[in-house]
């Protein structure tokens, strides 16, 4: 008699390895015979696709090597005609040993950047991620982090980051290793000790350190005048990434000397510089004409404290005058920031005026000096207790960096305001805010003895200061 | 670009005064940090230096012809000019104006293509 | 007066240098110009302030200047460098002064 078909065992979900066989049963009663068609994710498998095997009339469906692709819901539909179509629905479950698609790298990162070494994997279960670093499991902390794709991010990375890394991906069926890669920490070139400031007398000998660290080591250089080192002798040792410079000289003339230290990452180069003057004891230099020219000022450091349109005095007795004068006052304006705020922007603007004097406009280019009321002002209103403070130093030999005697003028030689007011060059910063007539200092007990023009400003907001000069 | 061109008489007789105008265009003669010299140079021989006007217009002489030489302005057409009183044929030279410039060290960085002066009876 | 002192002429090989020298005393002391004159030319400024380039003048055009002596290098001399070489000084009276000339012949 005819019967409509049963499904006699429904389907199960089945779980299959990657590349191995999988076959679901699905055996029907029924007569006549049945037509049995399946679907994987309601989309017909085809009889000839040959990625399957159908038999015993259709009841068995083998997945010849099972794909991750193949992962989905199988029915079997059987019909006779008598009756309706039965349908028995499973699931394929691929699983999957843990799979590294995506290893890690080798990686070159400059310290305080962030590091990212990727580890993506597949498997099923999903794998968890960890990382070994040389022998050790790595613990997570506030700049380590294992991310949801498998990948190791290292924030503000530091050289003891630097080692051998390895990504492991591990499931119930299995355990991934990726190859070790290496993350390498490169360090911008530091300077740990720079070269001390000497007052020598004429023919001595001086040994200048400059002590420089960075990964790679850098290389140090030594400038004298803005020119490359022409005499004395250079002795060089590298310790545990420390560079130690030594430049002995015998001194015949007065002179800033420039350590340099470079170190190169990829195609970029990273510098850190010191200077140190070396002056000779009661020298006077044996020319009395000015040596140099005129030009817009171009550096960073006076920006904001030198007058827009006018010219400026480079030296020539430098070889590189705008570098060798920038240079001068960037090595005395950080002095500076320890100094207090009455003072700070006065000796900023005494500063920068007299390293970059105005150009005459005449008609051969000569520096304006500085006139002496407005030094005076700075030396014995603004910055009275920091100036004693650097001449007792001065004085018992203990002023570190003797930039200042470059860079800081002897207010007695300059020529008076009053003698002729086109041969000095006034300090803005320093003059009376007529608009802002709030801006008188307190004025302290002991009167200064110095005829200030007008009276100064201690109003931050009536100074120009400019950002710190970067050397890097 | 500044642009400096001499003019003036090609023939002086001796005793009279040369007189040499050079006309500036480009830039003004008053213009800070720049001056303004003659400069000459006698028929296969060398250069010679013979004053300056300044931009405020002061003026400066080379000290063997400062007796003979004055050098002044015309603002209004920015003009400079030469006298050279009491002159005698070893003043005949090519003469020269050009810009000295404070920003080349004083240099004559502008030069005229200058203009023949002979001093014959 | 100050006094200036070259030498008439200096004679160099195609591509090889060339060392033209200006006596002064002291002339360290000052800027030194260079000037490069033509025949029936103008001069023209190829160095200021000892050893400054101007724009447009090649690179193997340096100088130096120290003690009595300021000296022009053209390294690798061309053919187009034949002419004639005049070093400049302001003293501090403001008095220029040249020197007498150096004519360069390229072999």
């Known amino acids: 008699l005819p019967k409509a078909p049963v499904i006699t065992t429904p389907l199960e979900t089945v779980d299959a390895l990657v590349e191995e066989v999988a076959t679901f049963m699905c055996a029907v009663e029924s007569y006549p015979q049945p037509e049995i068609s399946w679907t994987r994710n309601k989309i017909l498998i085809k009889l000839f696709d040959t990625r399957y095997s159908i038999r015993e009339n259709g009841q068995l469906l083998t997945i010849l090597s099972v794909e991750d692709s193949d992962d989905g819901i199988y029915c079997c539909t059987a019909n006779n005609g008598v009756g309706g179509a039965v349908e028995s629905c499973g699931a394929l479950q691929v699983k999957m040993k843990p799979k590294i698609t995506r290893p890690p790298i080798n990686v070159k990162i400059i310290e305080g950047l962030k590091a990212v070494l990727p580890c993506t994997t597949m498997g099923n279960p999903k794998p968890s991620v960890s990382w070994i670093k040389g022998d050790s499991p790595l613990r997570e902390n506030s700049r380590t982090a294992v991310l949801e794709s498998g990948s190791l991010r290292i924030h503000n990375v530091q050289k003891e980051d630097a080692g051998q890394y390895r990504c492991v991906a591990k499931n119930s069926l299995g355990t991934a290793y990726s190859k070790v890669v290496k993350l390498e920490v490169e360090v911008f070139a530091r300077i740990l000790r720079a070269p001390e400031s000497h007052n020598v007398t004429f023919g001595s000998f001086v040994t200048l350190h400059c002590t420089a660290t960075g990964i790679p080591v850098p290389t140090i250089t030594w400038i004298e005048n803005g020119n490359a080192v022409s005499s004395g002798s250079i002795q060089e040792s590298v310790k545990d990434r420390v560079i130690d410079s030594r430049l002995q000289l015998f001194i015949t003339k007065p002179g800033l000397y420039t350590c340099i230290a470079t170190n190169k990452h990829g195609e970029k180069f990273s510098t850190a510089k010191a200077a140190a003057t070396v002056s000779i004891a009661e020298w006077s230099k044996p020319q009395k004409d000015n040596k140099g020219y005129c030009a817009q000022y171009r550096g960073e450091v006076c920006n904001a404290v030198l007058a827009k349109d006018a010219l400026v005095f480079l030296n020539t007795s430098y070889a590189d005058p705008e570098e060798a004068q920038e240079l001068l006052v960037h090595t005395a304006w950080n002095e500076l920031k320890v100094v207090s705020p009455l003072c700070r922007p006065a000796a900023e603007a005494l500063l920068c005026n007299h390293v970059f004097q105005e150009c005459s406009p005449g008609v051969v280019p000569t520096p304006i000096p500085i006139c002496r009321e407005y030094c005076l002002a700075v030396k014995e209103l603004f910055c009275a207790k920091e100036w004693l403070a650097m001449e007792e130093k001065t004085h018992r030999g203990l002023y570190r960096s003797e930039m200042h005697l470059l860079s800081v003028p002897e207010c007695s030689k300059l020529p008076s305001m009053h003698w002729d007011p086109t041969a000095c060059a006034r300090l803005p910063h320093l003059d009376y805010n007529k608009e802002n007539p709030k801006t008188f200092p307190p004025m302290t007990s002991s009167k200064p003895s110095v005829d200030i023009p007008n009276l100064p400003s201690s109003s931050s907001s009536s100074f120009s200061v400019s950002p710190t000069y970067s050397m890097t | 670009q500044v642009q400096v061109q001499e003019s003036g008489p090609g023939l002086v007789k001796p005793s009279q005064t040369l007189s040499l105008t050079c006309t500036v265009s480009?830039?003004?003669?008053?213009?800070?940090?720049?001056?303004w010299s003659w400069i000459r140079q006698p028929p296969g021989k060398g250069l010679e230096w013979m004053g300056v006007i300044a931009y405020d217009g002061s003026t400066y002489y080379s000290p063997s012809l400062k007796s003979r030489t004055s050098i002044s302005r015309d603002t209004s057409k920015n003009q400079f000019s030469l006298h050279l009183s009491s002159v005698t044929p070893d003043d005949t030279a090519v003469y020269y104006c050009?810009?000295?410039?404070?920003?080349?060290?004083?240099?004559?960085?502008?030069w005229g293509q200058g203009t023949q002066v002979t001093v014959s009876s | 007066s100050y006094e200036l002192t070259q030498s008439p002429s200096v004679s160099v090989a195609l591509r090889q240098t060339a060392k033209i020298t200006c006596g002064g005393d002291n002339i360290g002391s000052k800027n030194a110009q260079w000037y490069q004159q033509k025949p029936g030319q103008a001069p023209v400024m190829v160095l200021y302030a000892d050893s400054r380039r101007p724009s447009g003048i090649p690179e193997r055009f340096s100088g130096s200047n120290s003690g009595n002596t300021a000296t022009l290098t053209i390294s690798g001399a061309q053919a187009e460098d034949e002419a004639d070489y005049y070093c400049?000084?302001?003293?501090?009276?403001?008095?220029?002064?040249f020197g007498g000339g150096t004519h360069l012949t390229v072999l």
């Open positions: 050009a810009r000295g410039s404070s920003r080349v060290a004083a240099a004559f960085d502008s």
């Open positions: 400049h000084v302001w003293d501090s009276s403001t008095n220029a002064w």
């Open positions: 480009g830039g003004s003669i008053t213009a800070r940090y720049y001056s």
